[in-house]
Amino acid sequence: CPTSCKCSSARIWCTEPSPGIVAFPRLEPNSVDPENITEILIANQKRLEIINEDDVEAYVGLRNLTIVDSGLKFVAYKAFLKNSNLRHINFTRNKLTSLSRRHFRHLDLSDLILTGNPFTCSCDIMWLKTLQETKSSPDTQDLYCLNESSKNMPLANLQIPNCGLPSARLAAPNLTVEEGKSVTLSCSVGGDPLPTLYWDVGNLVSKHMNETSHTQGSLRITNISSDDSGKQISCVAENLVGEDQDSVNLTVHFAPTITFLESPTSDHHWCIPFTVRGNPKPALQWFYNGAILNESKYICTKIHVTNHTEYHGCLQLDNPTHMNNGDYTLMAKNEYGKDERQISAHFMGRPGVDYETNPNYPEVLYEDWTTPTDIGDTTNKSNEIPSTDVADQSNREH
């Protein structure tokens, strides 16, 4: 632990003014693991002037960073790039004349306290004024900047010509695309200072490339994957003052696939579990020993979880007997194609068959094994996937 600092397994604090620290505290190799440090408190360190790009990166678990009553003048743009857990930053009473929003844009900060710094009135700090205006009143700070006459001016009164928030407008075609096809999105940005344009595609799987020239940009997505259905694509305009974005959701249509079909399991009911993917929503049809299976209140399809274009469910059977043993085929179909899979189901042995000689039969015995299950006595239901037991749980990825 550096002189003038104290270190515990989760905290570093440097408060002793002399000799003080001249650089951001770093832990010695083979001492405390920097990843476990959640709080760094620095006070009275007049010779600490800079936070370099790599000073803080080792402290990936850092949540609270406090540097107060010190000499901080400059913070490198990428200083906090690796510190995604940072929630509270306090730079009160330092020597900061400017601070860019680029330092913090990737962080989900609860607090950014900057009072008592000699900020210069310029477009560089207009983002702070914007930030103050969007905050609820109890959280606002008395921030000031020094104007051309070196007079302290409340940031709330700061007016800088040609210094405003940018705008982004996405000209997107109908973003419903068939799997394997391509699409191009166009975006125009504007503002003063002139913003930069970039695309936020999140975790898009499909191959994509962008072209940007000044205030226009295009994003071409090729050989679109069904995995990208429901994902959001954003065009972002960013300048010194802040950012604006325009977003579209991608809908990918594709033929159904049955990704999972298993032998029956017994819980409250018997269940033949399945997972089907497809968009638009596929219609499901069951076949029993090759013939259409007419569903009833004793044997029916239940969808338990819907995850955008993926459906997890069961063919649910109430008290099946040996009469229900056989081959079950699931067919999923939409306008782009169909898929089918089959499993063999064995619910129970025929009456009078000794279990000992049939070890493959499941260990399930029903007292009233002669009761029929009433299958086949109803007309075939709608071939759309029935409404779910569990509410739609669309997990959209951003």
Epitope: T3, T15, E16, P17, S18, P19, K46, R47, R93
Partner: antibody, heavy 116, light 110 residues
């Protein structure tokens, strides 16, 4: 060489004001904290407060907060300790000291006598 | 006001080794560095030990410092008559946001 030179002894009456000085030389005066220490006759050392001449930031001991004012003029590399209204109990030797690795450089001391 | 506690006096004969203790709390000695000062009669204090156990140049190696928990100590070996002085410990106190001195120890060389 690095040194701190303090102003001469003072004899004052209760209620009077006083400002004593401590001039640094031989080092970057604005880059080190300067502290003031009181020693009453026959007693131990008492830390009063510090100032960072680079930006005049000060810290006071709770015992001396509001009783004295510490200031600095970086243009002439001088730190000050002042009283607006002296009391007999302010009679003491006052030292200034540079804070680095410990208080490594001390002034020779200024004797302040307050008597009616 | 919290101060660091030292024995009021200590003594030893020439050549002997004496130790002066300095007891504090977690907010000062326990969490910060300790320095030691020697004040010869009629003189300004002089830095003897900094950062718990470091000697400035010019200070004889007969003087050594150590710290354990919330206590620190100054050891003087091979005691000499010119070591007769007052000795003070000091440390930054986090709860006060300021320095604190010890009560002082008067060392007599018999």
């Amino acid at each position: 060489q690095v040194q701190l030179v303090q102003s001469g002894a003072e004899v004052k009456k209760p209620g009077e004001s006083l400002k004593i000085s401590c001039k640094g030389s031989g080092y970057s005066f604005t880059s080190y904290w300067i502290g003031w220490v009181r020693q009453m006759p026959g007693k131990g050392l008492e830390w009063m407060g510090i100032i960072y001449p680079g930006d005049s930031d000060t810290r006071y001991s709770p015992s001396f907060q509001g009783q004295v004012t510490i200031s600095a003029d970086k243009s002439i590399s001088t730190a000050y300790l002042q009283w607006s209204s002296l009391k007999a109990s302010d009679t003491a030797m006052y030292y200034c000291a540079r804070h680095d690795y410990g208080m490594d450089v001390w002034g020779q001391g200024t004797m302040v006598t307050v008597s009616s | 006001l919290p101060v660091l506690t030292q024995p009021p006096s200590a003594s030893g004969t020439p050549g002997q080794r004496v130790t002066i203790s300095c007891s504090g709390s977690r907010s000062n000695v326990g969490g910060n560095t300790v320095s030691w000062y020697q004040q010869l009669p009629g003189s300004a204090p002089k830095l003897l030990i900094y950062t718990n156990n470091q000697r400035p140049s010019g200070v004889p190696d007969r003087f050594s410092g150590s710290k354990s928990g919330t206590s620190a100590s100054l050891a003087i070996s091979g005691l000499q008559s010119e070591d007769e002085a007052d000795y003070y410990c000091a440390a930054w106190d986090d709860s006060l946001n300021g320095y604190v001195f010890g009560t002082g120890t008067q060392l007599t060389v018999l």
